[in-house]
Interface confidence: medium
């Protein structure tokens, strides 16, 4: 099974060292997922030319991937801790179906794809504990997710390659923004 941060023997605190705070654990966890995404992107870029496609060309897609906007309160201008935390958790929950889609999309990095998915689930749990007083978090409908997954898997090879690339790029951008915002909390 993929090793998650905190499970690896290297992560065990040395005598007299400070245990990780919950913020540091979340920080480390996101960095771990980002490293996994980098590995997956390498495989995707090696097997298709999607990575060379311009951002504008790739923007012409009908995927509704979560994205940070000014109103979400996660940027320095207009930062709002509660609003932002809700956005991060909601966004991660929405990404779950796309991470499920990625599971059969990799050959040499199959285990890495699983690690990214599992680590994201753990991250959501961490963050839900942090946001226990916030009730504005909406979970995607399982039936909606199931039909979206079926739709994505029915695409032709070229579209599946593009979808994979877009999911990885968007998830990376979302996590980077989340990481920054969480460091302010």
């Amino acid at each position: 099974a993929p090793v998650l941060p905190g499970e690896d023997s290297k992560d065990v605190a040395a005598p007299h060292s400070q245990p990780l705070t919950s913020s540091e654990r979340i920080d480390k966890h996101i960095r771990y997922i980002l490293d996994g995404i980098s590995a997956l992107r390498k495989e995707t870029c090696n097997r298709s030319n999607m990575c060379e496609s311009s951002k504008e060309a790739l923007a012409e897609n009908n995927l509704n991937l979560p994205k940070m906007a000014e109103k979400d309160g996660c940027f320095q201008s207009g930062f709002n801790e509660d609003t932002c935390l809700v956005k991060i958790i909601t966004g991660l929950l929405e990404f779950e179906v796309y991470l499920e889609y990625l599971q059969n999309r990799f050959e040499s990095s199959e285990e890495q794809a699983r690690a990214v998915q599992m680590s994201t689930k753990v991250l959501i749990q961490f963050l839900q504990k942090k946001a226990k007083n916030l009730d504005a978090i909406t979970t995607p409908e399982p039936t909606t997710n199931a039909s979206l997954l079926t739709k994505l898997q029915a695409q032709n090879q070229w579209l599946q390659d593009m979808t994979t690339h877009l999911i990885l790029r968007s998830f990376k951008e979302f996590l980077q923004s989340s990481l920054r915002a969480l460091r302010q909390m």
């Epitope: 920080d27 320095q76 201008s77 207009g78 930062f79 920054r180 915002a181 460091r183």
Partner: antibody, heavy 122, light 109 residues
Framework: EVQLVESGGGLVQPGGSLRLSCAAS????????MSWVRQAPGKGLEWVSA????????SYADSVKGRFTISRDNAKNTLYLQMNSLKPEDTAVYYC???????????????WGQGTQVTVSS | QSALTQPSALSVTLGQTAKITCQGG??????AHWYQQKPGQAPVLVIY???SRPSGIPERFSGSSSGGRATLTISGAQAEDEGDYYC???????????FGGGTHLTVLG
């Protein structure tokens, strides 16, 4: 267009004081953290001090702690650096830098002024 | 405030790839950002958040970071890329900014 214009530099004797100003325009100044970064002649960049968007939090490099004070006036869109007890090793070009829309705890600098020269010499 | 280490100088032939590394400090947990500085000018941000490129920066500039080491890559270096390059990050507390010592890039030919 974002513009940062530093002023207040000059020649000062060791132990003296100077106050640098940085006039900002082209963005919502009160929404962004700001920093001062310096560069000694022929040397690399050295971060000096930072202040968050509201002015309530500040931080300093060890080399200037207790001698320099960063502040801002959001009504005037101006950043300041009060430099006291100046030493010859403070001689440098001082840049005012706007932090990107990133986060107070994880800065990067997306816009820089052209710098103002501070020379500390007897 | 822990320092970031960069090679002091690097030469690359026109059109070839230049890789500038930066390590140390808290790069394992903090983002790396890269700046280009030409003589007599203010620094310019060329890469932020390890691998993101600001608008207006040519696509030949890219960045990566892994295991406490950040790398700035210039694919197909041009004469105008000659100058000093600095990496920058936050310290582990996030309360201080740290710059690398700078790398002078020379483009030959």
């Amino acid at each position: 267009e974002v513009q940062l214009v530093e002023s207040g530099g000059g020649l000062v004797q060791p132990g003296g004081s100077l106050r640098l100003s940085c006039a900002a325009s082209g963005f919502t100044f009160s929404s962004y953290a700001m920093s001062w970064v310096r560069q000694a002649p022929g040397k690399g960049l050295e971060w000096v001090s930072a202040i968050n968007s509201g002015g309530g939090s500040t931080s300093y490099a060890d080399s200037v702690k207790g001698r320099f004070t960063i502040s801002r006036d959001n009504a005037k869109n101006t950043l300041y650096l009060q430099m006291n007890s100046l030493k010859p090793e403070d001689t440098a070009v001082y840049y005012c830098a706007k932090e990107g829309d990133t986060g107070w705890k994880d800065p990067m600098y997306d816009y820089w002024g052209q710098g103002t020269q501070v020379t500390v010499s007897s | 405030q822990s320092a970031l280490t960069q090679p002091s100088a690097l030469s690359v032939t026109l059109g070839q790839t230049a890789k500038i590394t930066c390590q140390g400090g808290s790069l394992g947990t903090r983002y790396a950002h890269w700046y280009q500085q030409k003589p007599g000018q203010a620094p310019v941000l060329v890469i932020y958040d390890d691998d993101s490129r600001p608008s207006g920066i040519p696509e030949r500039f890219s960045g990566s970071s892994s295991g406490g080491r950040a790398t700035l890559t210039i694919s197909g270096a041009q004469a105008e890329d000659e100058g000093d390059y600095y990496c920058q990050s936050a310290d582990s507390s996030g309360n201080a900014s740290v710059f690398g010592g700078g790398t002078h890039l020379t483009v030959l030919g």
